[in-house]
Amino acid sequence: IIGGSDADIKNFPWQVFFDNPWAGGALINEYWVLTAAHVVEGNREPTMYVGSTSVQTSRLAKSKMLTPEHVFIHPGWKLLEVPEGRTNFDNDIALVRLKDPVKMGPTVSPICLPGTSSDYNLMDGDLGLISGWGRTEKRDRAVRLKAARLPVAPLRKCKEVKVEKPTADAEAYVFTPNMICAGGEKGMDSCKGDSGGAFAVQDPNDKTKFYAAGLVSWGPQCGTYGLYTRVKNYVDWIMKTMQENSTPRED
């Protein structure tokens, strides 16, 4: 997180840490973690942790490890022979089904999914919270959780920023309605290592709750604007995937 500040896991109890690759995710119920497809495409058996503000190796040993049962990548995510050259991050969303249910508590609890009503349509200027252990101004990886509050911005703002190290022609980068552009204020942004974490917005119908409006996906340059998977467009797929892959006692 660039331009963010120290955060306590108690304020982001849905935050999941993936250690390989170094990334994030969001707990959405006791059996399921939501993340970005690009986080899990190269590792279908990710090790995840919840409930810890610090991901220092010695501290992780004492925190709650989650074991995956299966990874479900959105069928619209294009799997590439050489993922390094990716310019299309459309449908950057995945679900991880856990082997065992997560025990909830003050440092571990799920984030809501967006509702289907127009109340959950984001407007430019709407604020969302991002959190993670990715690159900061000072460190290549944060050991302690960082967070920032960012406004939603028009997609064109993201398009206008020059990609820092283009793996292809600038025109090749794909922008779709499945993406939210956010940031641009005071240099606050997500960055490498924050991928898959939630862009959390206050629930319009219950101010005590947050919902995952977006997932950290990609960006042209850290510290400018970032692109987030628009979770609202995938709620049907999420619900269907969870229903089709739940055990009878969960139903």
């Epitope: 120290d6 250690d19 390989n20 690759p21 170094w22 190269g42 991901v55 220092q56 190796t57 010695s58 992780l60 390094e84 690159r135 000072k138 460190r139 290549d140 990886r141 050991v143 302690r144 820092e164 190290k165 490498k192 340059q221 850290c222």
Partner: antibody
Framework: EVKLQQSGAELVRPGASVKLSCTAS????????IHWVKQRPEQGLEWIGR????????KYAPKFQVKATITADTSSNTAYLQLSSLTSEDTAVYYC????????????WGQGTTLTVSS | DIVLTQSPASLAVSLGQRATISCKAS??????????MNWYQQKTGQPPKILIY???NLESGIPARFSGSGSGTDFTLNIHPVEEEDAAIYYC?????????FGGGTKLEIK
């Protein structure tokens, strides 16, 4: 298994340039950070700089800012260190190393490349 | 740059005894409640190997006879009981501030 394989020893003339390579296996360099460290004969270790291969973002120690250029090719999972305007002071073993997970250390190292600058 | 001064430059310790190596930083290497001081071991012809990270945490697979302590500017590496295979050069390294810097090294000989 994580491994960093460095290119072979080099003997070069003063004033020339050289490009050393470090090929990773067991992990994708785009998910990581690769550092380079210099060790002169019978001397200590000096940090040269590092690269984020995902976006080419580099940082250098001030004394190596002009001397060294670090690059990476994610398609071949390889990082490079180019050294220019070589002098006898550049005679050393050069190591590439991976930045650790959950601790700010070098957790895996290449075997080192010996560079000898001599006429 | 943060300068790290190691002492002694070399020491000889009898098998089974304690080896103590000191590392002093020219300014604090503490940040966010952690001390960003690490210790490496380097044997002849090999790259360095991480032993201790964040001043006192033992790297996985490293024997418990190695321990680290300290905070701020003063740090110590202890090896007890010393074994034959511990003959090497030991370096402290700070990762709190760019550029990352190393101490000058301490050569440990086993008597």
């Amino acid at each position: 298994e994580v491994k960093l394989q460095q290119s072979g020893a080099e003997l070069v003339r003063p004033g020339a340039s050289v490009k050393l390579s470090c090929t990773a296996s067991g992990f994708n360099i785009k998910d990581d950070y690769i550092h380079w460290v210099k060790q002169r004969p019978e001397q200590g270790l000096e940090w040269i700089g590092r690269i984020d291969p995902a976006d080419g973002h580099t940082k250098y120690a001030p004394k190596f800012q002009v001397k060294a250029t670090i690059t990476a090719d994610t398609s071949s999972n390889t990082a490079y260190l180019q050294l220019s305007s070589l002098t006898s002071e550049d005679t050393a073993v050069y190591y590439c190393a991976r930045y650790g997970y959950g601790r700010e250390v070098f957790d895996y190292w290449g075997q080192g490349t010996t560079l000898t600058v001599s006429s | 740059d943060i300068v790290l001064t190691q002492s002694p430059a070399s020491l000889a310790v009898s098998l089974g005894q304690r080896a103590t190596i000191s590392c002093k930083a020219s300014q604090s290497v503490d940040y966010d409640g952690d001390s960003y001081m690490n210790w490496y071991q380097q044997k002849t012809g090999q790259p360095p190997k991480i032993l201790i990270y964040d001043a006192s945490n033992l790297e996985s697979g490293i024997p418990a006879r190695f321990s680290g302590s300290g905070s701020g500017t003063d740090f110590t590496l202890n090896i007890h009981p010393v074994e034959e295979e511990d003959a090497a050069i030991y370096y402290c390294q700070q990762s709190n501030e760019d550029p990352w810097t190393f101490g000058g090294g301490t050569k440990l000989e086993i008597k």
